[in-house]
Interface confidence: medium
């Protein structure tokens, strides 16, 4: 028998994929452990290997489909299973009534590129991906720059409160190497928490003209 | 085989309180959602709520805060615990479950049981 | 809530006749069901995802439809059949039932 604390936590992209973390104390680490998926109302089940990610938590990604069919609604509730194997048979480990659209986390938004960049701002685009047509304009946004010699973790949050997958950063310094960033969280469910962010975008604003102020 | 035995009916006074069971066979209530559905007399089906596989709940909002569903998993039961009753909760009490893994649509039925609110 | 209204509420017809029983949602619904209830029994699903037979169900009753319209057919009315059927929506919660159809024979 496996004791200790249990988290067992997951999040729907929106689409096709359910992600799940479980993390056990004092789990054995040889155990075979999966999720199983058994929605209320549909006519298919996933299941999905749990793989290490620490000395005590596993994870998973359940693929319910083609990454952007929309395998799941706000009625639906699928039940996830942890399953471990006990020598010849499986043991439940932990179970949750899982809301897809009250556990929401997207994928990074993608695509990013300089639409234009001039010395002291930058218009830059980029695009959501695999998101549910369900949420029609209801996604807002949050970015932020990195500038040289700061971390990402110093790097002021700014937020789009609506779905706006453009920004023009302002009051930038001539001839500087930038990074941008940006994540996106749909406004519905009481779990919804905020995509990973996306790739960096790098970019350097133009240099000043010689002979103007800057 | 699949069987749903509902009992607990009965007559109450308004305002009473009354706890249908459904005792389930041939499945484990921890691996499928069961439904509590209803039948006035002469008159059409109304779903009352449900207690999935996780033990999570969800209610029709005309009887949430009256009726609670609830479970005992080593007696392989379901509850429905239906408090300040009126008159026109008089009806038959069913509880269903749907059918095998992902089957919509609830394919086993209790043979119900009558609940009459009367002074 | 999801309101589901079926016509006729009642009808009757003869041994060997079509009968057709219409569902209208008050809004799109995706999955639709439909039971058969005789009197004084539990309801019986007859028809899941709006037009797949359940298990045992004679191929005479078939379902079609999409969107806020659906209909039922018993292709060839059989004495057994004199039963109030119900159609029902599992898009949205609360699940809403139609107020039934009852059939009965001439």
């Known amino acids: 028998a496996v004791n200790g604390t249990s988290r067992f936590t997951c999040f729907y992209n929106s689409r096709a994929n359910i992600s799940c973390v479980w993390s056990q104390d004092g789990a054995l680490q040889d155990t075979s452990c999966q999720v199983h998926a058994w929605p209320d109302r549909r006519r298919w089940n996933q299941t999905c290997e749990l793989l290490p990610v620490s000395q005590a938590s596993w994870a998973c990604n359940l693929i319910l489909g083609t990454p952007d069919s929309q395998k799941l609604t706000a009625v639906d509730i699928v039940t996830l299973r942890v399953m471990c194997r006990e020598g010849v048979r499986w043991r439940m480990m932990a179970i949750q009534d899982f809301k897809p659209f009250e556990n929401l986390r997207l994928m990074a938004p993608i695509s990013l590129q300089v639409v234009h960049v001039e010395t002291h701002r930058c218009n830059i685009s980029w695009k959501i991906s695999q998101a549910s047509h369900y949420f029609e304009r209801h996604l807002e946004f949050e970015a932020r720059t990195l500038s040289p010699g700061h971390t990402w973790e110093e790097a002021p949050l700014m937020t789009l409160k609506q779905k706006q997958e453009w920004i023009c950063l302002e009051t930038l310094t001539p001839d500087t190497q930038y990074e941008f960033q940006v994540r996106v969280k749909p406004l519905q469910g009481e779990f919804t928490t905020w995509s990973p962010w996306s790739q960096p975008l790098a970019f350097r604003t133009k240099p000043a003209a010689l002979g103007k102020d800057t | 085989e699949v069987q749903l035995l509902e009992s607990g009916g009965g007559l109450v006074q308004p305002g009473g309180s009354l706890r249908l069971s459904c005792a389930a066979s041939?499945?484990?209530?921890?691996?499928?959602?069961v439904h509590w559905i209803r039948q006035a007399p002469g008159k059409g089906l109304e779903w009352l709520g449900a207690?999935?596989?996780?033990?999570?709940?969800q209610y029709n909002a005309a009887v949430k805060g009256r009726f609670t569903i609830s479970r005992d998993n080593s007696k392989n039961t379901l509850y429905l615990q239906m408090n300040s009753l009126r008159a026109e909760d008089t009806a038959v009490y069913y509880c269903?479950?749907?059918?095998?893994?992902?089957?919509?649509?609830?394919?086993?039925w209790g043979q119900g049981t009558l609940v009459t609110v009367s002074s | 809530d999801i309101q589901m209204t079926q016509s006729p509420s009642s009808l009757s017809a003869s041994v060997g006749d079509r009968v057709t029983i219409t569902c209208q949602a008050s809004?799109?619904?995706?999955?639709l069901y439909w039971y058969q209830q005789r009197p004084g029994k539990a309801p019986r699903l007859l028809i899941y995802?709006?037009?797949n037979l359940a298990s045992g169900v004679p191929s005479r009753f078939s379902g079609s439809g999409s969107g806020t319209s659906y209909t039922f057919t018993i292709s060839s009315l059989q004495p057994e059949d004199i039963a109030t059927y119900y159609c029902?929506?599992?898009?949205?919660?609360?699940?809403?039932f139609g107020q039934g159809t009852k059939v009965e024979i001439k």
């Open positions: 269903a479950r749907a059918g095998d893994a992902n089957y919509d649509g609830f394919a086993y």
């Open positions: 041939g499945f484990s209530v921890t691996s499928y959602g």
């Open positions: 207690i999935w596989s996780g033990g999570s709940t």
């Open positions: 809004q799109s619904v995706s999955f």
């Open positions: 995802d709006t037009s």
């Open positions: 029902q929506q599992w898009s949205t919660y609360p699940l809403t």
